[in-house]
């Protein structure tokens, strides 16, 4: 059922990096406007974006909630002008999205070298704790502490003068490593979640190098 | 609230399997591991191994590896725990726990009521 | 494996307050380790206290505070109650897997 001159919307898919999350949808609106609706499996419908123009919907503030609750949205379809009107069943018409499970689905971020410090023949690389958007007692949580013992980081490293690569890998957000003296190290890290099964790898950082303004060299 | 509720006990003969159930309610299941531990008579507690119920990962005990299976049927929020191979000092209390999650607490907030496994020929 | 080591018993007064201690064979322990406490009072089940280092489940009384003390995780329990007499248990994570310690028999005397 459906209200004349209004389509249901399709593609509802959730974008959502770090927790910031939105969900997107077709078709751009022609003479019609869109409301969205949110809720965990056990939980009520709350609205949002009410009768927008937009094909997207920042869903984040519902999310950060408990991020590991399961979440679902709809989106209702209005007659631009016309908001009250519904279908013949007496209601709007509406789509559902895919279910949304914060935690176990968030892409991770593109994790940032913080720092690295070479001292003799070890050098220490710090991986900046990205901030969330998920909150604790009015503080903004930092990936590490959201994700926990769940999160590692891998650190490719490499000689500036060859390409052969080595990794590490971490449960904090810091890498001890070996290296030559007297040689230029090139760094890159990545994080990981490896009991997910999807999106279980953020795209690698920027590649830091030695020698560099990050870098801080100490001879011993 | 969060339930978890275990099988009954079990009696075995040595060298024999059990397979230990604990069904889980009142939260989203797929997002928290599940740890399994056991406590044999006027001992203490001992880490068998993990399932993250979304996933099926699992970790496991290096004592137990070739010996313990974690599953889970999401169909019915339950995971298992599958000891092989039983010998007589594998009788003890079997729990199944959850992490009481606020930020990033791990470990071992709410408790199964224990499953009382004995091995005896 | 490491080894996670507690005192295997301890006593303190009634209105009293007590530290117990969990150490690690590996070296300093640190959030990382994600230090949970578990009381077991006689012929009862495990119920957990902290978890997290210092986040205290919703039923735990805030007479009991988790913390790290130089290269240990602490338990500390101000103000002891006779029903605070139990077994306490201190779980390490380190990389793949948790790692119990002996526990703490505490008498509340």
């Known amino acids: 059922s459906g209200t004349t001159n209004t389509v249901a919307a399709y593609n509802l898919t959730w974008k959502s990096t770090n927790f910031k999350t939105i969900l997107e949808w077709e078709p751009k609106p022609v003479n019609q406007v869109y409301t969205v609706q949110i809720s965990t499996k056990s939980g009520d419908w709350k609205s949002k974006c009410f009768y927008t123009t937009d094909t997207e919907c920042d869903l984040t503030d519902e999310i950060v909630k408990d991020v590991k609750q399961t979440y679902l949205a709809r989106v209702f379809s209005y007659p631009a002008g016309n908001v009250e009107s519904t279908g013949s069943a007496g209601e709007p018409l509406y789509e559902n999205s895919p279910e949304f499970t914060p935690y176990l689905e968030t892409n991770l971020g593109q994790p940032t070298i913080q720092s690295f410090e070479q001292v003799g023949t070890k050098v220490n690389v710090t991986v900046e704790d990205e901030r969330t958007l998920v909150r604790r007692n009015n503080t903004f949580l930092s990936l590490r502490d959201v994700f926990g013992k769940d999160l590692i980081y891998t650190l490719y490293y490499w000689k500036s003068s060859s390409s052969g690569k080595k990794t590490a890998k971490t449960n904090t957000n810091e890498f001890l490593i070996d290296v030559d003296k007297g040689e230029n190290y090139c760094f890159s890290v990545q994080a990981v979640i490896p009991s997910r099964t999807v999106n279980r790898k953020s795209t690698d950082s920027p590649v830091e190098c030695m020698g560099q303004e990050k870098g801080e060299f100490r001879e011993i | 609230q969060v339930q978890l509720q275990e099988s009954g006990a079990e009696v075995k003969k040595p060298g024999a399997s059990v397979k230990v159930s604990c069904k889980a309610s009142g939260y989203t299941f797929s997002s928290y591991w599940i740890e399994w531990v056991r406590q044999a008579p006027g001992q203490g507690l001992e880490w068998m191994g993990e399932?993250?119920?979304?996933?099926?990962?699992?970790k496991y005990n290096e004592k137990f590896k070739g010996r313990v299976t974690m599953t889970r049927d999401t169909s019915t929020s339950t995971v298992y725990m599958e000891l092989s191979s039983l010998r007589s000092e594998d009788t003890a209390v079997y729990y199944c726990?959850?992490?009481?999650?606020?930020?990033?607490?791990?470990?071992?907030?709410?408790w199964g009521q224990g499953t009382l496994v004995t091995v005896s020929s | 494996q490491a080894v996670v080591t507690q005192e295997p018993s301890l006593t303190v007064s009634p209105g009293g307050t007590v530290t117990l201690t969990c150490r690690s064979s590996?070296?300093?322990?640190?959030?990382?380790?994600?230090a949970n406490w578990v009381q077991q009072k006689p012929g009862q089940l495990p119920k957990g206290l902290i978890s997290?280092?210092?986040n205290r489940g919703p039923w735990t009384t805030a007479r009991f505070s988790g913390s790290i003390l130089g290269d240990k995780a602490v338990l500390t329990l101000w103000g002891a109650h006779t029903e605070d007499e139990a077994v306490y248990y201190c779980?390490?994570?380190?990389?793949?897997?948790?790692?119990f310690g002996g526990g703490t028999k505490l008498t509340v005397l």
């Open positions: 997290g280092t210092n």
């Open positions: 399932i993250l119920p979304g996933s099926a990962s699992t």
């Open positions: 779980a390490l994570w380190y990389s793949n897997h948790w790692v």
């Open positions: 726990a959850r992490d009481y999650y606020y930020g990033s607490s791990y470990g071992f907030a709410y």
């Open positions: 590996t070296g300093a322990v640190t959030t990382s380790n994600y």
